[in-house]
Interface confidence: low
């Protein structure tokens, strides 16, 4: 009696249980009564990441410097290629189809995460005590100076964007 | 149909800078990259710089790099070329194209060029 | 950057008679995907270039099948099977694998 169901790495075909082609090859022919499934390996630009009765092998994905994407792991007959994005730029997408320059963190903002390939800058408001007066994609929201230690007293006020001016004690006569 | 134009050539005196306008029409211009090609007086081609559909990303070839800048208004289909400090090896037919993307590879479409006379 | 070269710089043809352009690359442009990043240019005097061959062997739409791309890696051809007064210009060829993307120098085609 024909089958209706087959092993794992098997399938159906024409009443029969046929051998499914291992990661990194593709489907000739399928299997017969007296010959086993055949199957031939990918070529170099191309893979297939499964167990499969796939009659072609998949294309490595281009990693388009167009699009400033450029390779972060070659492709195998196994594996598709991974682009990751050129410094200076990330990600749009977990998938990485294109790319973006990374985000500059505002006067009032510092870094609180730099970017990667795949993530964006992170930044957040400098807290009180802390200043950023630039817009960069690195720098981090800056002490206040302390204008006690250098045995000076405050003239002005820091913000977020600005450090406290320091002048010296006015002194008594 | 695909219709690339030119424009804001002339002639400039050296060291000074001008900016070249490209007019796109009859494609969906924010979808496809676009590169600037140029050629001196009785020579060959130079690729000059592309840019990508949205403008996030750009490429200059070395002679250009830091006096030349690419940047697109895709709003108003048209893709631009600043040149700055112009010098008399600028002095060429300065053609716009567009790419044919992943499917075509490289320049498919060109504009009729437009002369920029670098001269005192 | 990617230096393109191309042979002979001058070709005096035949009308009828087919002609040959070589192109080579100083380095693969053969992608792992398969493809040739090559293209092949022909500009006519006083005209803008025109698209002829893309990805090495493909011909753009409404060139005549005369022409042909062949070759793969750093080695290109391009072939006219029987030249036409019209085809008189200069042949480009171009990589457009990596930037700087970068052309060849021109291969002028006349009438004998």
């Known amino acids: 009696e024909p089958p209706t169901a087959c092993r794992e790495k098997q399938y159906l075909i024409n009443s029969q249980c046929c051998s499914l082609c291992q990661p990194g090859q593709k489907l000739v022919s399928d299997c017969t009564e007296f010959t086993e499934t055949e199957c031939l390996p990918c070529s170099e630009s191309e893979f297939l990441d499964t167990w499969n009765r796939e009659t072609r092998c998949h294309q490595h994905k281009y990693c388009d410097p167009n699009l400033g994407l450029q390779v972060q792991q070659k492709g195998t007959s196994e594996t598709d290629t991974i682009c990751t994005c050129e410094e200076g730029l990330h990600c749009t997408s977990e998938s990485c189809e294109s790319c973006v320059p990374h985000r500059s963190c505002l006067p009032g903002f510092g870094v609180k995460q730099i970017a990667t390939g795949v993530s964006d800058t992170i930044c957040e408001p400098c807290p009180v005590g802390f200043f950023s007066n630039v817009s960069s994609a690195f720098e981090k929201c800056r002490p206040w100076t302390s204008c006690e230690t250098k045995d000076l007293v405050v003239q002005q006020a820091g913000t977020n964007k600005t450090d406290v001016v320091c002048g010296p004690q006015d002194r008594q006569r | 149909q695909v219709q690339l134009v030119e424009s804001g050539g002339g002639v400039v005196q050296p060291g000074r800078s001008l900016r070249l306008s490209c007019a796109a029409s009859?494609?969906?211009?924010?979808?496809?990259?676009m590169h600037w090609v140029r050629q001196a007086p009785g020579k060959g081609l130079e690729w000059v710089a592309v840019?990508?559909?949205?403008?996030?990303?750009?490429y200059y070839a070395n002679s250009v790099k830091g006096r030349f800048t690419i940047s697109r208004d895709n709003s108003k289909n048209t893709l631009y070329l600043q040149i700055n400090s112009l010098r008399a090896e600028d002095t060429a037919v300065y053609y716009c194209?567009?790419?044919?993307?992943?499917?075509?590879?490289?320049?498919?479409?060109w504009g009729q060029g437009i002369l920029v006379t670098v001269s005192s | 950057d990617i230096v393109m070269t191309q042979s002979p710089l001058s070709l005096p043809v035949t009308p009828g008679e087919p002609a040959s352009i070589s192109c080579r690359s100083s380095q693969s442009v053969l992608y792992s995907n398969g493809y040739n990043y090559l293209d092949w240019y022909l500009q006519k005097p006083g005209q803008s270039p025109q698209l002829l061959i893309y990805?090495?062997?493909n011909r753009a739409s409404g060139v005549p099948d005369r022409f042909s791309g062949s070759g793969s890696g750093t080695d290109f051809t391009l072939k006219i099977s029987r030249v036409e007064a019209e085809d008189v210009g200069v042949y480009y060829c171009m990589q457009v694998l990596q930037t700087p993307f970068t052309f060849g120098p021109g291969t002028k085609v006349d009438i004998k």
């Open positions: 990805l090495g062997s």
């Open positions: 194209a567009r790419d044919g993307g992943k499917a075509v590879p490289g320049p498919d479409y």
């Open positions: 009859g494609f969906t211009f924010s979808s496809y990259v």
């Open positions: 840019m990508s559909y949205d403008g996030s990303s750009k």
